[in-house]
């Protein structure tokens, strides 16, 4: 009569995490007498999964009634599969022996692969803001997926990015994997409303990729541009000078007026005008009593934005010769002679 063969018909079985896995095994003969066991892995160090003879295996059930007379089906089902269950499973026939049973024959093995979904990608940006034309890095992380094959793409406002580096860990065999990617993005002035998206595609997602997003508004600082101008006034002894603070982001801004280097007034920007690109504008004005000055006045608008070093713009307000001679007594002939704004940044 032919010697017993152990048949494991499937070379591989793939199961989604949380499901049950059925591992099939059949014998061609009832002899020799002895139990069957299932192991994960082969050789020294293999892990016992099920022993027909003894033991408690709460996640394992037999497909057939093993005690049934003439039973040759030794298939098992393992419940609630996790990535840690991945591996090659061997159905092994033992021959009754004394004191211990002896391994008689093994099946060829069934490789169980576990499909586990990646976690929702988490995108994080730089710790400090950067200004336009500078490059910032965004990272994207996802964990717990299996198998290892995974695709990650980066987008900025729907346009695919190419400057990124991705690692999948660990490099070798593992029950599950993690992905880490770093993208480099060059900031532009219009990026306040921009978004970066990390998109992950994996076999478990059935063509519906996972996305993680980050707003460039968290990463960008657009420094303001300053313009100091003089507005026409009816009263000859007064000058109205405005400081137009334009296209800045984020909101936080403090403005100080200086007359000939001395602080005249400090104010914090409150009512801001938002531009279409997400940046803000703000205007501050200073009323100067020209009668109080015998000499020309240098007015400086100094702006501290988002905790950065202050920038400033100056304006030379000329006091007419007529006013200089007569001082504050002469008001009606006071002439305001505006000059070109003086550029300057502190």
């Amino acid at each position: 009569e032919d010697e017993l063969q152990v048949i494991q018909p499937e070379k591989s079985v793939s199961v989604a995490a949380g499901e049950s896995a059925t591992l099939r095994c059949a014998m061609t003969s009832l002899i020799p007498v002895g139990p069957i066991m299932w192991f994960r892995g082969a050789g020294a160090g293999r892990e016992l999964i099920y022993n027909q003879k003894e033991g408690h295996f709460p996640r394992v059930t037999t497909v057939s009634e093993l005690t049934k007379r003439n039973n040759l089906d030794f298939s098992i089902s393992i419940s609630n599969i996790t990535p840690a269950d991945a591996g090659t499973y061997y159905c092994v026939k033992f021959r009754k022996g004394s004191p211990d049973d002896v391994e008689f024959k093994s099946g060829a093995g069934t490789e169980l692969s576990v499909r586990a979904k990646p976690s929702a990608p988490v995108v994080s940006g730089p710790a400090v803001r950067a200004t336009p034309e500078h490059t910032v890095s965004f990272t994207c992380e996802s964990h717990g997926f299996s198998p290892r094959d995974i695709t990650l793409k980066w987008f900025k406002n729907g346009n695919e990015l190419s400057d990124f580096q991705t690692n999948v860990d660990p490099a070798g065999d593992s029950v599950s994997y993690s992905i880490h990617s770093t993208a480099r993005v060059v900031l532009t002035r219009g990026d306040v409303h921009s978004q970066v998206i990390c998109e992950i595609a994996h076999i478990t997602l059935q063509g519906d990729p996972l996305r993680g997003t980050a707003n460039l508004s968290e990463a960008i600082r657009v420094p303001p541009t300053l313009e100091v101008t003089q507005q026409p006034m009816r009263a000859e002894n007064q000058a109205n000078v405005t400081c137009q603070v334009s296209n800045f982001y984020p909101r936080g801004l403090q403005l100080t007026w200086l007359e000939n280097g001395n602080v005249s007034r400090t104010e914090t920007a409150s009512t801001l005008i938002e531009n279409k690109d997400g940046t803000y504008n703000w205007m501050s004005w200073l009323l100067v009593n020209t009668c109080a000055h015998r000499d020309d006045v240098v007015l400086t608008c100094q702006v501290e934005h988002d905790g950065q070093q202050a920038v400033s713009k100056s304006y030379a307000l000329e006091i007419s010769a007529h006013q200089k001679e007569h001082g504050s007594d002469i008001t009606h002939e006071a002439a305001l002679a505006p000059t070109a704004p003086l550029g300057g940044s502190g």
């Epitope: 152990v6 994960r40 892995g41 082969a42 050789g43 020294a44 160090g45 293999r46 892990e47 991945a86 591996g87 090659t88 061997y90 024959k105 093994s106 099946g107 060829a108 093995g109 490789e111 660990p170 070798g172 065999d173 593992s174």
Partner: antibody
Framework: QVQLQESGPGLVRPSETLSLTCTVS????????WSWIRQPPGKGLEWIGF???????FYNPSLKSRVTISLDMSINQFSLKMTSVTAADTAVYYC????????????????WGQGTTVTVSS | DIVMTQSPLSLPVTPGEPASISCKSS???????????LDWYLQRPGQSPQLLIY???NRASGVPDRFSGSGSGTDFTLKISRVEAEDVGVYYC?????????FGGGTKVEIK
């Protein structure tokens, strides 16, 4: 580059407990078996036992009653404790990494420590 | 336990010449997955052992191609195609089919 470093007392009194630690640097403990092997002076190699990163242990039956292998993944270390030592336990003790693949099993002890000499003497 | 028997005990070699070491196991190391659970190690004088061959015939990373492993079941051979001075030391075979892992007694290779 993974490196293993054994540490522990070089001299142990008879009937006392031998304790050795192996520190794994430059790599992870995950997905490997971690082995202890010894070599008495002028003799061959003897496998003591190993531990999988999940904590499953396998011991040489000839030493099983006296040996415990444990690991601490948080500090990348695994340890050997051998009780009731005698002069026959005098040897160079090696810790080693054993590669393992789920579909194959063990496929080579590919990284070894430099070994630490333990003498059992009163 | 599986008993591993190596021969010869000592092997004097001439540099540039081939050398061969035999290892026999008391039971087959060939499993149903078609792998032979046998490794070869070299222990140079005063050093730790190093892996040469795993699973019967696979050369470990960084091992020169003058080393090769062959055989199946119970009979295995390690061959060095052209011996070099750095190849001296004790060669061990080890079975990894079942615990306890067991080593052969070793073959000492020395230059003539």
């Amino acid at each position: 580059q993974v490196q293993l470093q054994e540490s522990g007392p070089g001299l142990v009194r008879p009937s006392e407990t031998l304790s050795l630690t192996c520190t794994v640097s430059g790599g992870s403990i995950r997905n490997y078996y971690w082995s202890w092997i010894r070599q008495p002076p002028g003799k061959g190699l003897e496998w003591i036992g190993f531990i999988y990163y999940t904590g499953r242990t396998f011991y040489n039956p000839s030493l099983k009653s006296r040996v415990t292998i444990s690991l601490d993944m948080s500090i990348n270390q695994f340890s050997l404790k051998m009780t009731s030592v005698t002069a026959a336990d005098t040897a160079v003790y090696y810790c080693a990494r054993v590669r393992a693949y789920s579909g194959i099993g063990l496929d080579g002890t590919d990284v070894w420590g430099q070994g630490t000499t333990v003498t059992v003497s009163s | 336990d599986i008993v591993m028997t190596q021969s010869p005990l000592s092997l004097p070699v001439t540099p540039g010449e081939p050398a061969s070491i035999s290892c026999k196991s008391s039971q087959s190391l060939l499993y149903s997955n078609a792998y032979n659970y046998l490794d070869w190690y070299l222990q140079r004088p005063g050093q730790s052992p190093q892996l040469l061959i795993y699973l019967g015939s696979n050369r470990a990373s960084g091992v020169p191609d003058r080393f090769s492993g062959s055989g199946s079941g119970t009979d295995f051979t390690l061959k060095i195609s052209r011996v070099e001075a750095e190849d001296v030391g004790v060669y061990y075979c080890m079975q990894a089919l079942q615990t306890p892992l067991t080593f052969g007694g070793g073959t000492k290779v020395e230059i003539k």
